[in-house]
């Protein structure tokens, strides 16, 4: 019961986490700029992985996609890749974990198969969570680096003058969503891995089988010490070795030439 609960909870936590990673990846608010006032209008700028947006004090908002791939910073490309890998791994993990859930019966799937699938999905969730956390952290680091590099930066270009505007870019909501979602996916993955240990059978119980030995037709009879416990009809505390192939419930009631004290 505890295993089922752990597995189910791990699945739900991972599901929420992956939904969060998808949401963070699609959000525009990865970096937000403090309100910049100029003679025309107050401008609020925010950027995501896929487009950059500007909102004016009038409420008008314009978003432009990053249509070029070559002109984009390598770090931004890396963050995109990490987030997409995280989503793909998470989605595959969810698919695998659905079939691995103990509460869902699919044909005659054995517990060992479910255990393996649970472990696989757990590892996928852990890697997915780590990808999301890494992606968000790389972006955050890029923001911090850009802020310090842009401080008091001014240069002349093509006859005109280019001046860096001193407006601080802060961490957007998407970063926090990404960190939390990545953490949840990671926790869910760990829970799935813990559940896997409970699902895996500790030891395999084989049915008793007796074998005919060559030569004197001597066969070892499993459960031969059963009489010593005080149960069964053999009360002489004998080890029972029977030449015939019988089940363990057939206790010998007469002596034979193969009985040994």
């Amino acid at each position: 019961m505890a295993v089922t609960a752990c597995q189910g909870l791990g699945f739900v936590v991972s599901l929420i986490g992956i939904a969060g990673i998808i949401a963070a990846t699609c959000m525009d608010q990865w970096s937000t700029q403090d309100l910049y006032n100029n003679p025309v209008t107050a401008v609020f700028n925010y950027q995501g992985l896929w487009r950059s947006c500007v909102r004016e004090s009038s409420g008008f908002t314009e978003c432009r996609g990053y249509f070029t791939l070559l002109g984009l910073p390598a770090m931004l490309q890396a963050v995109r890749a990490l987030m997409i890998v995280g989503i793909v791994l998470g989605a595959i993990g969810l698919l695998v974990s659905i079939f691995a859930l103990k509460c869902i019966r699919i044909g005659s799937m054995e517990d060992s198969a479910k255990a393996n699938m649970t472990l696989t999905s757990g590892i996928m969730f852990i890697v997915s969570g780590l990808c999301a956390i890494a992606g968000v952290s790389v972006f955050a680091n890029m923001l911090v680096t850009n802020f310090w590099m842009s401080t008091a930066n001014m240069y002349t270009g093509m006859g005109g003058m280019v001046q860096t505007v001193q407006t601080r870019y802060t961490f957007g909501a998407a970063l926090f969503v990404g960190w939390v979602a990545g953490g949840l996916t990671l926790i869910g993955g760990v829970m799935m891995c813990i559940a896997c240990r409970g699902l895996a059978p500790e030891e395999t119980n084989y049915k008793a089988v007796s074998y005919h030995a060559s030569g004197h037709s001597v066969a070892y009879k499993p459960g031969g010490f059963k009489a010593s416990t005080g149960f069964g009809s053999n009360t002489k505390n004998k080890k029972i070795y029977d030449g015939g192939a019988r089940t363990e419930d057939e206790v010998q009631s007469y002596p034979s030439k193969h009985d040994y004290v």
């Epitope: 990865w30 970096s31 700029q33 910049y36 100029n38 025309v40 209008t41 401008v43 700028n45 950027q47 950059s52 947006c53 500007v54 004016e56 004090s57 009038s58 008008f60 908002t61 314009e62 432009r64 990053y66 002109g71 910073p73 770090m75 931004l76 972006f139 890029m142 923001l143 850009n146 802020f147 842009s150 270009g157 005109g160 003058m161 280019v162 001046q163 860096t164 505007v165 407006t167 870019y169």
Partner: nanobody, 120 residues
């Protein structure tokens, strides 16, 4: 790197018209504000007109009703239509744009200026 290309300046008679244009190129994500400033000899640089992406405009007191600013967002270009020009409009006109040029990077870029002379 962001570059501005200004054009349209020249000599014009009082009461005449001129159209200035300024095109931005380079690493550009957004251009929230585009505008024109001018600086007459021995005077401070002053705002002529500015326009936001959404079309919000602001004009300097001395040019209201005579000058019209417009922009083409697709071409990252701003235009200044100057009508009923006066001798006191003589100045170097500078294009000014606020450019979001990268992740966490906002630049204020100035053009090299184009001279407008209003004279008989």
């Amino acid at each position: 790197q962001v570059q501005l290309q200004e054009s349209g300046g020249g000599l014009v008679q009082p009461g005449g018209s001129l159209r200035l244009s300024c095109a931005a190129s380079g690493s550009i994500f957004n251009i929230p504000v585009m505008g024109w400033y001018r600086q007459a000899p021995g005077k401070q640089r002053e705002l002529v007109a500015g326009i936001s992406t959404g079309g919000t405009t602001n004009y300097g007191d001395s040019v209201k009703g005579r000058f019209t600013i417009s922009r083409d967002n697709a071409k990252n270009t701003v235009y200044l239509q100057m009508n009923s020009l006066k001798p006191e409009d003589t100045a170097v006109y500078y294009c000014n744009v606020l450019v979001v040029s990268g992740i966490g990077s906002t630049l204020e870029v100035w053009g090299q200026g184009t001279l407008v002379t209003v004279s008989e």
